[in-house]
């Protein structure tokens, strides 16, 4: 029962985590214009992995995709790759874990096979979570570096008279979503790995031994089954699973376009 709960919870946590990783990857607010200690602008700039956006004071928002592949910074490409690898591994892990769930019976799948699948999905979730955390952290590090570089030469003089204000960027909402989602996926993966230990059949498997007593025979079988009497009873042993109540995933609500300006 505890194993089923651990496995089920691990699956749900990983599912939420992977949904979060997908959401973070798609979000535009990986970096947002730093409004602190800056001239008050009538525009708000923010950037994602795939496009950059500008929201004007009227509320009009204009986004432009990064239509070049070679012209993009290597770090951005690396972050994209990490997030996509995380999503792919997570998706495969989810697929594998569905079949590995103890509460789902598929044919005559052995517990050992389920244990292996649970371990596989657990490892996939762990790697997926690590990819997401790494991707977000690399981007965050890139932002911090650029932030201090632009602070150092915030006002770059042009001809001594004219000044160009450099737009500084700080952490966007997607980074926090990514970190949390990566963490959840990682935790879910660990829970799956823990559940795998409980699912794995013990090394010493005792064969069923029949004890012949006078008048009737009773076959004792290991593994928690009730003993079945041998006199003409054709009753098959059935495992009764406590499926448990499964909570629905909460609907992911994306940030609405707030009236920032």
């Amino acid at each position: 029962m505890a194993v089923t709960a651990c496995q089920g919870l691990g699956f749900v946590v990983s599912l939420i985590g992977i949904a979060g990783i997908i959401a973070a990857t798609c979000m535009d607010q990986w970096s947002t214009q730093d409004l602190y200690n800056n001239p008050v602008t009538a525009v708000f700039n923010y950037q994602g992995l795939w496009r950059s956006c500008v929201r004007e004071s009227s509320g009009f928002t204009e986004c432009r995709g990064y239509f070049t592949l070679l012209g993009l910074p290597a770090m951005l490409q690396a972050v994209r790759a990490l997030m996509i690898v995380g999503i792919v591994l997570g998706a495969i892990g989810l697929l594998v874990s569905i079949f590995a769930l103890k509460c789902i019976r598929i044919g005559s799948m052995e517990d050992s096979a389920k244990a292996n699948m649970t371990l596989t999905s657990g490892i996939m979730f762990i790697v997926s979570g690590l990819c997401a955390i790494a991707g977000v952290s690399v981007f965050a590090n890139m932002l911090v570096t650029n932030f201090w570089m632009s602070t150092a030469n915030m006002y770059t003089g042009m001809g001594g008279m004219v000044q160009t204000v450099q737009t500084r960027y700080t952490f966007g909402a997607a980074l926090f979503v990514g970190w949390v989602a990566g963490g959840l996926t990682l935790i879910g993966g660990v829970m799956m790995c823990i559940a795998c230990r409980g699912l794995a059949p013990e090394e010493t498997n005792y064969k069923a031994v029949s004890y012949h007593a006078s008048g009737h025979s009773v076959a004792y079988k290991p593994g928690g089954f009730k003993a079945s009497t041998g006199f003409g009873s054709n009753t098959k042993n059935k495992k009764i699973y406590d499926g448990g109540a499964r909570t629905e995933d909460e609907v992911q609500s994306y940030p609405s376009k707030h009236d920032y300006v």
């Epitope: 214009q33 001239p39 008050v40 602008t41 009538a42 525009v43 700039n45 923010y46 950037q47 950059s52 956006c53 500008v54 004007e56 004071s57 009227s58 509320g59 009009f60 204009e62 432009r64 042009m158 004219v162 000044q163 160009t164 204000v165 450099q166 737009t167 707030h258 009236d259 920032y260 300006v261």
Partner: antibody
Framework: EVQLVESGGGLVQPGGSLRLSCAAS????????IHWVRQAPGKGLEWVAY????????YYADTVKGRFTISRDNAKNSLYLQMNSLRAEDTAVYYC?????????????WGQGTTVTVSS | DIVMTQSPDSLAVSLGERATINCKSS????????????LAWYQQKPGQPPKLLIY???TRASGVPDRFSGSGSGTDFTLTISSLQAEDVAVYYC?????????FGQGTKLEIK
């Protein structure tokens, strides 16, 4: 047809107060940010204040900060400018102007203006 | 605050001739996020409110004749009237639309020579 009509101007003594109104029609008022801009006699244009469509963002020119208050009532399609502690240099024609939606923050429609005279 | 400086203060041009008004800002009005310039040009005829001519440094507002054109980027901008008409006599203002407080140039008075 987009229309902005200012009212509430008049003669006021220094230190006095005045409340300007701007009635909007011909467009969905709650979808647009609105500005107040003034023009002193024979002088150029001076931006005064801005209020966003949902009133969440308000900006003022340094010359009026702390003395003027911009507000709006989307239900009444109206914009207001409460002017307190008026000075002689506040004498001007006051225009309300709509911040265009996709005009790079430029003001695409202007009212005819209302005259405020601060004099003793 | 951003200082907008227009030149010349006044300009007299013959009908049908080209009129050019310059505007210089103390800081770049080019937004790095979308590489767009946030500068507008307004026309104000005597006794009338200003009218938007150009926004985004080079985009004509609706209903504006194509003889009006805007150019420039960063800190230097130009309004050009390719063939001056009698109804173009007015004061022209440039405006910073990127930084609050929004600031206007001092204006350029355009007259017919």
């Amino acid at each position: 047809e987009v229309q902005l009509v200012e009212s509430g101007g008049g003669l006021v003594q220094p230190g006095g107060s005045l409340r300007l109104s701007c009635a909007a029609s011909g467009f969905t008022f709650s979808d647009y940010g609105i500005h107040w801009v003034r023009q002193a006699p024979g002088k150029g244009l001076e931006w005064v204040a801005y209020i966003s469509r949902g009133s969440s963002t308000i900006y003022y020119a340094d010359t009026v900060k702390g003395r003027f208050t911009i507000s709006r009532d989307n239900a009444k399609n109206s914009l207001y400018l409460q002017m307190n502690s008026l000075r002689a240099e506040d004498t001007a024609v006051y225009y309300c102007a709509r911040g265009g939606y996709d005009t790079r923050n430029a003001m695409d429609y202007w009212g005819q203006g209302t005259t405020v005279t601060v004099s003793s | 605050d951003i200082v907008m400086t227009q030149s010349p203060d006044s300009l007299a041009v013959s009908l049908g001739e080209r009129a050019t008004i310059n505007c210089k800002s103390s800081q770049s009005l080019l937004n790095s996020g979308n590489q767009k310039n946030y500068l507008a040009w307004y026309q104000q005829k005597p006794g009338q409110p200003p009218k938007l001519l150009i926004y985004g440094a080079s985009t004509r507002a609706s209903g504006v004749p194509d003889r009006f054109s805007g150019s420039g980027s960063g800190t230097d901008f130009t309004l050009t009237i390719s063939s001056l008409q009698a109804e173009d006599v007015a004061v022209y203002y440039c405006q910073n639309d990127l930084y609050y407080p929004l600031t206007f140039g001092q204006g350029t008075k355009l007259e017919i020579k």
